[in-house]
Amino acid sequence: ALDTNYCFRNLEENCCVRPLYIDFRQDLGWKWVHEPKGYYANFCSGPCPYLRSADTTHSTVLGLYNTLNPEASASPCCVPQDLEPLTILYYVGRTPKVEQLSNMVVKSCKCS
Amino acid sequence: ALDTNYCFRNLEENCCVRPLYIDFRQDLGWKWVHEPKGYYANFCSGPCPYLRSADTTHSTVLGLYNTLNPEASASPCCVPQDLEPLTILYYVGRTPKVEQLSNMVVKSCKCS
């Protein structure tokens, strides 16, 4: 699986999850998030050679097409597969509120 | 929606579904498919600027991060959203068989 366990431990050029730390204020301009100050959102990148973690029959077909037609511009792309939520603390006036934001952290990638 | 209705009628540079015809024998080396000889598999391509058909909170966050940090290499990618099956005819010896292959045709795209 192209997950953090594998990708963060290997120098992998092909499609894999990469570490990306985002600071809410500096990187997004979000002043309303009190805690955490930032988080590892991560991202997916790297080429999708034929059959690498193909998501659907279409991505397998497209990968095969690309292999047999190297001049083709159509190829699968490395995108998030498994995402996890992030729990944040913010304030409504002086009242603290805890919220779980869904699909905030990339845990693994796929070729789609 | 970044679907065939919209994308095939507009000269859209950003993420959109593009027409791609695949000939089973010539492009994939599949001799076992009798009919059709080929089909429009289509593919997704084009940049994913901030908020363009963002798939998840993560892709929205990543798009915003990319906008505010133009030097960043992390950005969402244009990939299939809706896929449709394709019905094919193949032969087992001299006996014809009909099969529906799932997820073969891209109908719309998203930024993921």
């Epitope: 059959l51 029959t57 397998t60 077909v61 095969l64 292999t67 047999l68 | 994939l28 080396g29 599949w30 001799k31 076992w32 193949y90 032969y91 087992v92 010896g93 001299r94 006996t95 099969e99 292959l101």
Partner: antibody
Framework: QVLLVQSGADVRKPGASVKIFCKAS????????ISWVRQTPAQGFEWMGG????????NYAQRFKGRLVLTADTSTNTAYMELRSLKSADTAVYYC?????????????WGQGSLVTVSS | EIQMTQSPSSLSASPGDRVTITCRAS???????LAWYQQKPGKVPKLLIY???SRAPGVPSRFSGSGSGTDFTLTISSLEPEDAATYYC?????????FGQGTKLEIK
């Protein structure tokens, strides 16, 4: 060059199952069809079935239907043959082979064979 | 299922001889659903002929196939010592694929 490498010899008890793998290299696995054939001194060659790897379509010989499962994993270029409810008559050398392209076809490349012995 | 019957079941011939093996199907295969294989002891089968008459890549020209319908032949025009093997025909017109029982060829 094209290579089909199969798992090694196996001994099983009657009623058990056996699963054999067939790993392909040197050609486009997903463009071909993989057939499974077994050979015994008594029955000669028997075709068991075939699988189209990329779409996982399997076709089985009638006599094996219900206890034979053919699958393929395109990510590892590997085909699998699982035979259940083994009988002593299933003792044979099992071969995977790539066909010339059709579901039923001549077979141009063969694995080295996997001897399965069914004995109590 | 289609039965395939080979004849002879065994034969012995000398280097340079012309050898013919026949294969009869229990029902018509048309003109192109037949293959021939060579198998040496302890080895895997090797495809010689497909489509009744097309030689597989790398197969010497002394091997040829012919026939249609129910009757097919494999001919070795000039026997070589390395041709000692068992030869099998195979039909792929209908499921299940079936094979002949084999013809064992010995070199004198």
């Amino acid at each position: 060059q094209v290579l089909l490498v199969q798992s090694g010899a196996d001994v099983r008890k009657p009623g058990a199952s056996v699963k054999i793998f067939c790993k392909a290299s040197g050609y486009t696995f997903t463009s071909n069809v993989i057939s499974w054939v077994r050979q015994t001194p008594a029955q000669g060659f028997e075709w068991m079935g075939g699988v189209i790897p990329i779409v996982d379509i399997a076709n089985y010989a009638q006599r094996f239907k219900g206890r034979l499962v053919l699958t393929a994993d395109t990510s590892t270029n590997t085909a699998y043959m699982e035979l259940r409810s083994l009988k002593s008559a299933d003792t044979a050398v099992y071969y995977c082979a790539s066909t010339l392209g059709l579901v039923l076809d001549a077979m141009d490349y063969w694995g080295q064979g996997s001897l399965v012995t069914v004995s109590s | 299922e289609i039965q395939m019957t080979q004849s002879p079941s065994s034969l012995s011939a000398s280097p340079g001889d012309r050898v013919t093996i026949t294969c009869r199907a229990s029902q018509s295969l048309g003109s192109s659903y037949l293959a021939w294989y060579q198998q040496k002891p302890g080895k895997v089968p090797k495809l010689l002929i497909y489509g009744a008459s097309s030689r597989a890549p790398g197969v010497p020209s002394r091997f040829s196939g012919s026939g249609s319908g129910t009757d097919f032949t494999l001919t070795i025009s000039s026997l070589e010592p390395e041709d000692a093997a068992t030869y099998y025909c195979q039909q792929y017109a209908d499921s299940p694929i079936t094979f002949g029982q084999g013809t064992k060829l010995e070199i004198k």
